[in-house]
């Protein structure tokens, strides 16, 4: 008995369905046993589904009730499953196992990694620090959602709406602006992007003079 998954990594959008491929080969014609899928986590194994060749009965892990189904060709060497209504919690590595009681080896397994794709949510832009001439401030940008994890990049425009270079790398967050001055004034756009989408937010920077105590 041998089992293989035809792809190492699968990508599918949140809310959609995905078929996790798994095929098996055996020299026996009798199909008495089980197809099982588990999700392999860092601290535990989570049962996804167990399917009985004889009774055709499904046993689901709690998160998978009625949204996982085994291939119609399960008895013809196809142990693939389809997972519906994908969520971010479905990200991870899955293991397909086929157990046939009449096969000498009984048990065989293979793995596939599922990456659930989610476009970045509109990022939150914020300023850390006091917007006073001479101070250092930090511009932060973060999307609450996004899979794969979003990449962040910054662009800067002056009051005349002309793009200007940034003195530090434009990728990543946060953006540190040192010793701000009237030259720093303008607006800053953060772009959050991944394989499936792009979103942005902007911040206006208007440094004010320090208050004078007489």
């Amino acid at each position: 008995l041998t089992v293989e998954t035809t792809q190492d990594i699968l990508r599918a959008a949140r809310g959609r369905s995905v078929t996790l491929p798994c095929t098996y080969n055996t020299y026996v014609s009798d199909r008495e046993g089980f197809i099982q899928w588990d999700k392999l986590l860092r601290s535990q194994t989570e049962r996804v589904v167990t399917w009985n060749f004889v009774t055709k009965k499904y046993i689901y892990g709690n998160r998978y009730e009625n949204r996982v189904r085994v291939s119609n060709d399960a008895e013809l060497s196809n142990a693939s499953i389809t997972i519906d209504q994908l969520t971010m919690d479905d990200n991870g590595t899955y293991e397909c196992s086929v157990s046939l009681m009449s096969d000498q080896d009984v048990n065989a397994k293979s793995r596939v990694r599922l990456l659930v794709l989610v476009p970045p949510s509109k990022p939150d832009c914020s300023i850390q620090g006091e917007m006073v001439i001479g101070n250092n401030i930090q511009l932060t940008c973060h999307s609450a959602e996004g899979s794969p994890s979003p990449q962040y990049s910054w662009k800067s425009y002056n009051a005349q709406n002309q793009q200007r270079p940034l003195t530090q790398p434009v990728s990543g967050e946060p953006l540190l602006l040192k010793n701000i001055s009237t030259e720093t004034a303008g607006y800053y756009i953060c772009t959050s992007s991944n394989d499936v989408g792009i979103e942005s937010c902007n911040i206006t920077v208007a440094p004010r003079p320090p208050s004078m105590n007489i």
């Epitope: 099982q36 392999l40 601290s43 049962r47 167990t50 709690n62 196992s97 157990s99 009984v106 065989a108």
Partner: antibody
Framework: EVQLVESGGGLVKPGGSLRLSCAAS????????MNWVRQAPGKGLEWVSS????????YYADSVKGRFTISRDNAKNSLYLQMNSLRAEDTAVYYC???????????WGQGTMVTVSS | AIQLTQSPSSLSASVGDRVTITCRAS??????LNWYQQKPGKAPKLLIY???SLQSGVPSRFSGSGSGTDFTLTISSLQPEDFATYYC????????FGQGTKVEIK
């Protein structure tokens, strides 16, 4: 015949170390996840640790985390449990067990006794 | 961690009796519940897996049922060789065992 045979048990002082072995035969060892389960004298069964067929996924019970290390050598059809910083409460018969359908332990060894005492 | 509570912790029965042991999980474990028999000085032996599947070579007088949190092991007609301790085990989320039920001769 499908068989698991444990060895390496014995008497050890608190704070000491011991390495248990489990020799598998009669099945394709590299196809199965393997486990250690223990049973203190007169008590019930307690799962200790699990290792996937290729050693990628390893799990431990909270009671042994950081002290015990499970490993396997598929070329030698062998499973191991390295036990460090042993305590009196680790005294038990230690069984190795094969993980079958849906996580059930379908084949067990005969067990090896570990006694931690000064 | 998921906890399993077996009841009763011990029972006395006669040969031919119908014996029922229950196991309750602290949260839903679907049908990922297994039953083992252990005799003194011996290793446990798998009887039932995924709640109701009979392990190869186990007599048909043993049966299991249940799903979610409540499970039952039934011995339809107790035989002399069935006097032993029985353990339930969940395999849904790592593994935990029940505390055991000792079946003694009345």
């Amino acid at each position: 015949e499908v068989q698991l045979v444990e060895s390496g048990g014995g008497l050890v002082k608190p704070g000491g170390s011991l390495r248990l072995s489990c020799a598998a035969s009669g099945f394709t060892f590299s196809s199965y996840s393997m486990n250690w389960v223990r049973q203190a004298p007169g008590k019930g069964l307690e799962w200790v640790s699990s290792i996937s067929r290729d050693s990628t996924y390893i799990y431990y019970a909270d009671s042994v985390k950081g002290r015990f290390t499970i490993s396997r050598d598929n070329a030698k059809n062998s499973l191991y449990l390295q036990m460090n910083s042993l305590r009196a409460e680790d005294t038990a018969v230690y069984y190795c067990a094969r993980e079958g359908v849906a996580g059930a332990f379908d084949i067990w060894g005969q067990g090896t006794m570990v006694t931690v005492s000064s | 961690a998921i906890q399993l509570t077996q009841s009763p912790s011990s029972l006395s029965a006669s040969v031919g009796d119908r014996v029922t042991i229950t196991c309750r999980a602290s949260q839903s474990i679907s049908s990922y519940l297994n039953w083992y028999q252990q005799k003194p000085g011996k290793a446990p032996k798998l009887l039932i897996y995924i709640a109701s599947s009979l392990q190869s070579g186990v007599p048909s007088r043993f049966s299991g049922s249940g799903s979610g949190t409540d499970f039952t092991l039934t011995i339809s007609s107790l035989q002399p060789e069935d006097f032993a301790t029985y353990y339930c085990q969940q395999s849904y989320n790592t593994w935990t065992f029940g505390q055991g039920t000792k079946v003694e001769i009345k």
